[in-house]
Amino acid sequence: NSYYDKVLAHSRIRGRDQGPNVCALQQILGTKKKYFSSCKNWYQGAICGKKTTVLYECCPGYMRMEGMKGCPAVMPIDHVYGTLGIVGATTTQHYSDVSKLREEIEGKGSYTYFAPSNEAWENLDSDIRRGLENNVNVELLNALHSHMVNKRMLTKDLKHGMVIPSMYNNLGLFINHYPNGVVTVNCARVIHGNQIATNGVVHVIDRVLTQIGTSIQDFLEAEDDLSSFRAAAITSDLLESLGRDGHFTLFAPTNEAFEKLPRGVLERIMGDKVASEALMKYHILNTLQCSEAITGGAVFETMEGNTIEIGCEGDSISINGIKMVNKKDIVTKNGVIHLIDEVLIPDSAKQVIELAGKQQTTFTDLVAQLGLASSLKPDGEYTLLAPVNNAFSDDTLSMDQRLLKLILQNHILKVKVGLSDLYNGQILETIGGKQLRVFVYRTAICIENSCMVRGSKQGRNGAIHIFREIIQPAEKSLHDKLRQDKRFSIFLSLLEAADLKDLLTQPGDWTLFAPTNDAFKGMTSEERELLIGDKNALQNIILYHLTPGVYIGKGFEPGVTNILKTTQGSKIYLKGVNETLLVNELKSKESDIMTTNGVIHVVDKLLYPADIPVGNDQLLELLNKLIKYIQIKFVRGSTFKEIPMTVYRPAMTKIQIEGDPDFRLIKEGETVTEVIHGEPVIKKYTKIIDGVPVEITEKQTREERIITGPEIKYTRISTGGGETGETLQKFLQKEVSKVTKFIEGGDGHLFEDEEIKRLLQGDTPAKKIPANKRVQGPRRRSREGRSQ
């Protein structure tokens, strides 16, 4: 069944309470526009955002009988001329009579007549109508023939994109058959279709078809009010392409539209071939979109590649939410033109700073005020990491301007990094020289402490990503952070007693659930000695608070339990609820304290692995005193297993030094120069590109490094955790169904095969990755069973 027939069937279902063969139609309030009711329009009770009233009429081909419910009688079948009267197209019938078309459509043959309704004739320009009436034998006859086809074609035969030769000089009739059931002929809507006649079929349309002989190019060349657009099209080498065959839709900005543009913006775009071509192509669709087919908001891809949203508000058409179409449906032989009173500027023609929306104005204002905007050169490439307006507190805004400038510099990258270029473990360099880490989670991407929200865009000289908070690059290690905060003095002393200090000092990627001194309330010095005395017990307890991988609370899907494997080996349960992180259902007191080697979440209770039994009465007594949220198992004689710490020592990158370094004796006042020659370092890692793991080999050519004293600069080189670059497909901000996610082992930045699909914008589904094809990074440990 065709779309038209499906919508008609829906209308019939909605009208069946009124009797047989009754169809429900919706009329837009304040207009004469009626539509067969689609499911969507029925439930919305509106078309084009305007309220509708429901009318019940006989379905096409049926009629009422006096004293009977509904439309039980079938309409009489007649020749095409008689059928014009049956469907109420009496003006077209009259014109068919006076133009001597009548005998043709009463006689032998098979015809399709697209008959303008009486109202359509009334709406026709009076000069054109007078011209037809003054020359009925030629002009009127030709005009009517241009509404006819030499064979019977029902709506099911009227396929989208079809061009049918009319009975006047074979001039084309452009058929469009849209998914919402609207069928148009040269953008005139079929308002009553499929009225069968003995020698054909009649479709009533809502306007008179005017003759089409010109292309879009011809129209642009002839129309003085489009001279700015025409000149821009010539500059962009696009005018000629609008003369070619096709089914285009052109949203043509008038000269007034160009006048509204800030001069500097237009000058810059027109001076840049790439940007000016993008600007022009953004006004063109490769499909024919008649205004009558727009009954609600829909997104269309432009020739430029980005999308525009075309909507409607009563009789007006809006583009990207703004009412701007002031003349609709200028039909040409290769498409349709709608005149618009604003120039549409695609992101790809905008400077990176112009990509910011209403929610990032504080950021862009500050960038301008603090003189950073001038460093964003039109020919450079940048990435703005723009926090939303409410990320800037009054305290931040009242900071010393130099400090504020440094903060803002942390939000501008030296290179253009698109959303799909981001991967877990990536290091990004800011214009201030700071290094920012990227963390990719199931439904979020975070840079340092701040996670992205929807709305990433790519412009002419860069990209913009939107963030919930101000990005704060870490300055201190986990150990240093704990040491500078008195709240963690007991935990820190236990950590040092367990010989675990180094673990939190060295480079790495960790999540630490750090218990405050409150967690140890009531612990006596004897009990402390008891705990320290059993090193294995102490290590097990402390390492249960540490998880490989950086897990930012804001990166978690709200309301979903995330099960992580701790360094100790047992599972820990994390859940984000109402901006609060729950750790084993205990509320975190503070979360997302970033460090150079991980993140700290503060807890005020000691955590303990529920699956590990205690075999010592005194220790059990102490743990029961400190831990109230679980019942600790007691198994007499059981001991804590030793945890081999070698697994957690950071991996080092070995640099081969060819031969001994050269040293020379130097006089006082000279500097020491140590020249190290070395082979290139080959780095291998896996990136998931379009859903398929691809092993990438990166050769870092190690040039001579000259280390000069007395101010010795050095470079520490080490491999981080397993870097798996993900080309992400869909970035969901939505809260999805409350599912428990099971993440075990590794650095935890895992994607279930199906979930890659859900991550980043764009609906392209990722290919399914077979489980055995998942390639692991250099420092990943084995993954145990995983389940959804």
């Epitope: 700015s228 006048e259 001076g271």
Partner: antibody, heavy 118, light 110 residues
Amino acid sequence: QVQLVQSGAEVKKPGASVKVSCKASGYTFTSYGISWVRQAPGQGLEWMGWISAYDGNTNYAQKLQGRVTMTTDTSTSTAYMELRSLRSDDTAVYYCARDMLVVPFDYWGQGTLVTVSS
Amino acid sequence: QSVLTQSSSASGTPGQTVTVSCSGSSSDIGSNRVNWYQQLPGTAPKLLIYSNDQRPSGVPDRFSGSKSGTSASLAISGLQSADEADYYCAAWDDSLSTYVFGSGTKVTVL
């Protein structure tokens, strides 16, 4: 055809004001802007500013900000440029030009000589 | 003091090609398009080239424009005596938010 006809020559004393008119014909006046450009004797061209005939939006050269006012009268398809606090270095030929933005200054008026002399 | 720099004069014999250069900065020519105007002696200027290399209708194809980085040039091939005039380059300047002209180049046909 497109024509821009400017008012006649003016002689003004320093400190006075001058108002030059530019009547447009042969095109839809509100569909284009008007720019004003001046040329001192034996010198190059200097852009003074622009006005959109569609909505009266203006953009003046920084140098003249506060001294120049550009207006349009759509009923007569005429653009005006008023320059106040005249100085001797304002002596120049003042041109109006149709400004399509995409195609800047595609048609020019014949010019109006303004002489500032005490 | 013009923001765009042009050589003060250029000359050639009939039939020759003459090139007029125009130098600017990243805030004008570097970021925006260049337009060229011809001013015959005693007349108003006339648009010759817009958007770096586009000729308005009626301008012979002997005139061609190009832009590279922060400089632009106008080439006049098949030089004719009627081409004797002043030639001005112009561009929008982002930093000044002003439309700036070059100092002008007088082309003489020998």
